[in-house]
């Protein structure tokens, strides 16, 4: 279900990541260097910004972020 | 600086109806929600609801459905709780804390309620 | 509603040791805890959020780790300034719920 319109809820931050608010509603997400082979679960719809770098992520399938707008 | 003042100790009978208010300076009133938080003596903390001061949509913790009513003035930057039916377990500080996409990042001085026949 | 479980209750150290402080919750809460700093007479302070993002501000000894439903706040050596209560925070679901503290005192 969508997560309930709130200004207490934190937004999906995937485990180890570092994430940042980005104004009222979006999230800055930062998986860069973590030895990641693919994509992070859980990654919010609201994300604005997503850094994959230096990781190995060796292929992506087509539209590999469906949630993401 | 982000500065949120908010009104003195209050005194109440049981049955009774409080109103606290907190006046936000320093930031825009409109782009944070409000949040509100009571702390019993010796105890932990305790959310009450939310505010969204943009439109006055509100989240209430269940316990309180009812019993309180949160309020905004966007022309004094003000938020306001109104806490009805007061029994001595609602003897506690209340603060407004201000919050942005999940976290509080700034919080009141707190305002005792002492509930007392 | 998530139970927030804090322990221990009361944490007793010196200024330079190592203070660990745990919380639990009844259920996974997706790394979505925050942690605040409480002293006396003085407005809560917000120290981490996200579970390891540290706020503007909070010094580096400050830490915050953990996943699913067990996390974790390290200060890597206290300071005397640090003497104070600890409380964690949930924001995966309504409502936001808190542990019941973590008073850091000295010994």
């Known amino acids: 279900g969508s997560s309930p319109r709130s200004g207490v809820l934190l937004r999906g931050c995937p485990t180890h990541c570092h994430c940042e608010p980005d104004g009222r509603m979006l999230l800055r997400v930062d998986c860069s260097d973590l030895g990641l082979s693919e994509l992070p679960s859980n990654l919010s719809v609201f994300t604005s910004y997503l850094d994959l770098s230096m990781n190995n992520i060796s292929q992506l399938l087509p539209n590999p972020l469906p949630s993401l707008r | 600086q982000v500065q949120l003042v908010q009104s003195g100790a209050e005194v109440k009978k049981p049955g009774a109806s409080v109103k606290v208010s907190c006046k936000a300076s320093?930031?825009?009133?409109?782009?944070?929600?409000m949040q509100w938080v009571r702390q019993a003596p010796g105890q932990g903390l305790e959310w009450i609801g939310e505010?969204?001061?943009?439109?006055?949509?509100?989240n209430y913790n269940q316990k309180f459905q009812g019993r309180v009513t949160l309020t905004v003035d966007t022309s004094t930057s003000t938020a306001y709780m109104e806490l009805s039916s007061l029994r001595s377990e609602d003897t506690a500080v209340y603060y407004c804390a201000r919050s942005l996409s999940g976290y509080v990042d700034y919080w009141g001085q707190g305002t005792t309620v002492t509930v007392s026949s | 509603d998530i139970v927030m479980t804090q322990s221990p209750a009361t944490l007793s150290l010196s200024p330079g040791e190592r203070a660990t402080l745990s919380c639990r919750a009844s259920?996974?809460?997706?790394?979505?805890l925050n942690w605040y700093q409480q002293k006396p007479g003085q407005a809560v302070r917000l120290l981490i959020s996200?579970?390891?993002r540290l706020h503007s501000g909070v010094p580096a000894r400050f830490s915050g780790s953990g996943s699913g439903t067990d996390y974790t706040l390290t200060i890597s050596s206290l300071e005397p300034e640090d003497f104070a209560v600890y409380f964690c925070q949930q924001g995966n679901s309504l409502p936001p719920t808190f542990g019941g503290g973590t008073k850091l005192e000295i010994k």
């Open positions: 505010i969204d001061p943009s439109d006055s949509y509100t």
């Open positions: 320093g930031y825009t009133f409109t782009n944070y929600w």
């Open positions: 259920q996974d809460i997706s790394n979505r």
């Open positions: 996200y579970r390891s």
